[in-house]
């Protein structure tokens, strides 16, 4: 039985250049959390933490991601391209798998607040 | 072109311990994670542990807990596999294989070294 | 640990025949991953994230699959596909192996 829940950063925005941190929390439950993948739209993955292995990032976004803080990730060098959905799946012993969504918006103007609202998917 | 070369066969008397390694060219060594599977005669496969080159540290399948020894030379690109206290029970063919880090499959597997372990 | 179960153990399919081999897992999976080996020689990723082909795999192989239910299949069966296929995947705190289905050319 599942009983956990995700807590995300929801939608947020961030400027062109600058850096953003996308943050998951997982919630209500006792599992143990044996890995985190950080994917794409597109479900390509951007990095993993795994609780054994420590964190590796994919050759693809090795200069402009940063792990952390914690089990979350700092996008870096954010271009209008960076723009959408993204994705923290936790693996769970013993619920399983738990999924939650972020939308970046990377915007132009020098005015953009980056958002640092937790919400509920 | 990627390859993962492994050290040749090995005969070994119950009790001992063997060392075998996995050299790794035509890719960044430390771009993935390194795997070590088993395969018994006429059977199937059994994962033993990963490795992690950036850092050296290894995630192990329960089973080859205290059986199997995960290390990483990472200027040579070498990922080793030491197996101590041997028994007919180890005698297979050990496979090292490129992993893929989110999704936990190989996309590259070694040649594979045969251990016979036999008085 | 998650246990894999195929069926069948062994098969032989005619030239041009359709061949679907499954793959059964005791708990919910979110990936199964397929590796083809050819006696005497190392197994080959074949299908990957349940559905994706290896680089180099013809397209008459297809996978699929979710929850506890996945398949192998090949449109149609050719000479140079008689191998053994093993399912593979990884959940949270286990990576294990079906024991495999042997494939052999009528």
């Known amino acids: 039985m599942m009983t956990g829940t995700i807590e995300t950063t929801g939608n947020i925005s961030a400027k062109k250049g600058g850096s953003v941190i996308l943050q998951c929390h997982l919630s209500s439950t006792m599992a143990q959390v044996t890995q985190v993948n950080w994917e794409q739209h597109d479900h390509s993955l951007l990095a993993i933490r795994n609780a054994e292995l420590g964190w590796h990032i994919y050759p693809a976004f090795k200069d402009r991601v940063a792990p952390g803080p914690g089990l979350g990730l700092t996008l870096q060098s954010l271009t209008m391209n960076d723009t959408g959905e993204y994705f923290c799946t936790y693996h769970t012993y013993p619920d399983g798998t738990y999924r939650g969504r972020i939308f970046l918006e990377v915007l132009e103007s020098s005015v953009a607040e980056h958002s640092a609202r937790f919400q509920i998917p | 072109e990627v390859q993962l070369q492994q050290s040749g066969p090995e005969l070994v008397k119950p009790g001992a311990s063997v060392k075998m390694s996995c050299k790794a060219s035509g890719f960044t060594f430390t771009d993935y994670f390194m795997d070590w599977v088993k395969q018994s005669r006429g059977a199937s496969f059994e994962w033993i542990g990963r490795l992690n080159p950036n850092n050296g540290r290894t995630s192990y399948n329960q089973k080859f807990k205290g059986k199997a020894t995960l290390t990483v030379d990472k200027s040579s690109s070498t990922a080793y596999m030491e197996l101590n206290s041997l028994t007919s029970e180890d005698s297979a063919v050990y496979y090292c294989a490129r992993g893929d880090l989110g999704r936990w499959y190989f996309d590259v597997w070694g040649a594979g070294t045969t251990v016979t372990v036999s008085s | 640990q998650i246990v894999l179960t195929q069926s069948p153990a062994i098969m032989s399919a005619s030239p041009g025949e359709k061949v679907t081999m499954t793959c059964s897992a005791s708990?919910?999976?979110?990936?199964m991953h397929w590796y083809q080996q050819k006696s005497g020689t190392s197994p080959k990723r074949w299908i990957y994230d349940t559905s994706k082909l290896a680089s180099g795999v013809p397209t008459r192989f297809s996978g699929s699959g979710s929850g506890t239910s996945y398949s192998l299949t090949i449109s149609s069966m050719e000479a140079e596909d008689a191998a053994s296929y093993f399912c593979q995947q990884w959940s949270s705190n286990s990576l294990t192996f079906g024991a495999g289905t042997k494939l052999e050319l009528k």
């Open positions: 708990s919910s999976v979110s990936y």
